[in-house]
């Protein structure tokens, strides 16, 4: 049986093994086509979601479609209601909370009150003045806060009361992948883990742990990735694993927070990593622990020189690092976080690329998050 | 629309208190702030303060701190100015009004006389 | 404080002229935290315009109010009979909020 299933697929009426290798190869084998179904699917960037939630306060702001202008909500007459809908309309399934903010006197937005219109939230006409002088601050999900705060110090090994959110992601029960934990349904991680085997069968995720071997894993329900393009395979390194049962969240077991989609990160803003990758580059072995290090963010006009990733570096992707190198993610931390802390975690970018591991002048790559808000958006609604 | 019914005409002595309400209906208390500005006879207007009733803290203009508190009670949905140690100077109309930055619906006024 | 200055201190205007009332802040505030309000004799002050230029609701089109930094207009393109009060600008922005000394528009 455990050799059937590791070599071969059961297609049914009639009932007849193929070779597991057909799978997901584009050729319907199956009569039924289901050798074809469970794999990694794309999943288009979609159109505008127009809500959206600022890094002042977590703030909500509500789009026009009429106009293309942003404007942010008031208080006044907000309810939960709204509230639910606004995080519906960004995917989410469970319970907000929000609370009133006083407008900042650097308010750059116009300010308008906002009402309910076929499940989307609108500016209601002719709304007057805020009269609450607050805007709505809105929490889709709680997320972010650890059990424990990490130093600051060069690399050491992690434990999971820090980075709750962190997952192994493995095929034939081989670590490939790190992940994070985003909602009890879904992980987000690097495209590029699922680009030689892209039947979502095999893999799994494993979450509540720092030890690779030690935890249960979890079934994949779907992969869902971007357009793949071939001409640069570097671009989109996004994906989104929606687990077949929700996960129950502990001390040990949470979720990261998505970045604002205004969080721009200055050079040198510190920044951590984590992962079980490859200790050295070209050899070394996987690391059975976690391990974390501290970063920063690296300009990216820096990380484009000539001395260094010469323009492949895209404003979809971002670099960080440490100066003098020495201290980068490497094979096997793929998919995993790189993230900021501010009142909470905050995943900023995806475990991607790099030439060598640690170099000076070539630090890690990273899929930029805030860049791809719309489209992680667009498929939880799509999936809601 | 937000309507503000204010208390009546007070007369009050130098070094005493005054506590004038402002008490709204339609709309929801809770979500707007109330301000306070008053105008003294034959004078412009001036910032006293405001509260938002869903936070509870008040603010306050610098020149009234520590003789004015503005309160809000959300059940019969009425907002509070008290002023004290008053002096000839505070001779006014007391006014509330909905809003924060930009003042909506304003209450009828209440004229506060002191006088020995 | 920032200080609201407005000028004329009164304007005598004929009806269905142009009125045109200034207020100049001492330092610059955002445009989205300007007011102006019309007060008559014995009543409480009405809001006309807020965010500098965005007319409240109820307020006919004749009044309209521009400008940024520190220097703000209000216009009201032909005077009625019932447009004859006090004018006071209002700034939002920095706290304390501050009210201008007023503009009366008087009949000429």
């Known amino acids: 049986k455990v050799i059937l299933d590791k070599y071969y697929f059961l297609c049914g009426q009639p009932l007849h093994f193929i070779p597991r290798k057909q799978l997901c190869d584009g050729e319907l084998d199956c009569p039924l086509g289901e050798d074809e179904e469970h794999c990694v699917k794309s999943f288009p960037e979609g159109p505008a979601v127009a809500v959206r939630l600022s890094k002042d306060r977590s703030t909500l702001q509500v789009l026009d479609s009429a106009t293309g202008n942003w404007f942010s909500a008031c208080f006044d007459n907000f309810t939960e209601a709204l509230a639910e809908t606004a995080c519906r309309q960004m995917g989410y399934s469970s319970k907000p909370t929000f609370r009133a903010v006083e407008i900042g006197p650097d308010q750059d937005l116009d300010v308008v009150e906002i009402t309910e219109n076929s499940q989307e939230l609108r500016m209601r006409n002719s709304s007057g003045p805020c009269l609450s002088g607050s805007l709505v601050s809105l929490h889709c999900l709680a997320c972010g806060k650890s059990l424990k705060t990490p130093r600051v110090v060069g690399v050491e090994e992690a434990s999971v009361d820090s980075w709750p959110w962190q997952v192994s992601i493995q095929y034939d029960k081989q670590h490939v992948c790190g992940g994070s934990i985003l909602d009890p349904h879904w992980v987000l991680t690097a495209a590029h883990c699922f680009r030689k085997h892209t039947d979502v069968f095999n893999w799994k995720v494993r979450a509540g742990s720092d030890k690779l071997g030690s935890f249960p894993s979890l079934a994949v329900a779907k992969i869902i990735i971007i357009e793949f393009n071939p001409m640069y395979p570097k671009d989109n390194d996004i994906a989104l694993m929606k687990l077949q049962f929700p996960l129950t969240f502990s001390g040990t077991v949470r979720p990261i927070c998505l970045p604002f989609f205004d969080e721009e990160l200055t050079p040198a803003t510190p920044l951590w990593i984590i992962g079980w990758g490859f200790t050295k580059q070209n050899g070394g072995k996987m690391s059975d622990i976690l391990l974390q290090a501290s970063v920063q963010v690296i300009d990216s006009t820096r990380c484009n020189a000539d001395d260094a990733y010469q323009g492949e570096v895209t404003e979809k992707m971002m670099c960080a690092g440490i100066p003098e190198g020495g201290v980068d993610t490497c094979q096997g931390d793929s998919g995993g976080p790189l993230m900021y802390q501010s009142d909470q975690w905050h995943v900023v970018g995806i475990v991607s690329w790099g030439y060598g591991c640690g170099g000076p002048s070539t630090p890690g790559v990273y899929t930029k998050v805030s860049a791809y808000l719309n489209w992680i958006y667009n498929v939880w609604k799509a999936e809601l | 629309q937000v309507q503000l019914v204010q208390s009546g005409a007070e007369v009050k002595k130098p070094g005493s208190s005054v506590k004038v309400s402002c008490k709204a209906s339609?709309?929801?208390?809770?979500?707007?702030?109330i301000s306070w500005v008053r105008q003294a006879p034959g004078q412009g207007l001036e910032w006293v303060g405001g509260?938002?009733?869903?936070?509870?803290?008040?603010n306050y203009a610098q020149k009234f701190q520590g003789r004015v508190t503005i309160t809000a009670d959300e059940s019969p949905s009425t907002a509070y100015m008290e002023l004290s140690s008053l002096r000839s100077e505070d001779t006014a109309v007391y006014y509330c009004?909905?809003?924060?930055?930009?003042?909506?619906?304003w209450g009828q006024g209440t004229l506060v006389t002191v006088s020995s | 404080e920032i200080v609201m200055t407005q000028s004329p201190a009164t304007l005598s205007v004929s009806p269905g002229e142009r009125a045109t009332l200034s207020c100049r802040a001492s330092?610059?505030?955002?445009?989205?935290?300007l007011a102006w309000y019309q007060q008559k004799p014995g009543q409480a002050p009405r809001l006309l315009i807020y965010?500098?230029?965005t007319r409240a609701t109820g307020i006919p089109a004749r009044f309209s109010g521009s400008g940024s930094g520190t220097e703000f207009t209000l216009t009201i393109s032909s005077l009625q009979s019932e447009d004859f009060a006090v004018y006071y600008c209002?700034?939002?922005?920095?706290?304390?909020?501050?009210f201008g000394q007023g503009t009366k528009v008087e009949i000429k």
């Open positions: 009004a909905t809003g924060r930055r930009e003042l909506l619906n």
């Open positions: 339609g709309g929801t208390f809770s979500s707007y702030a």
């Open positions: 509260i938002m009733p869903i936070f509870g803290t008040a």
């Open positions: 330092q610059s505030v955002n445009s989205r935290f």
């Open positions: 965010g500098a230029s």
């Open positions: 209002m700034q939002g922005t920095h706290w304390p909020y501050t």
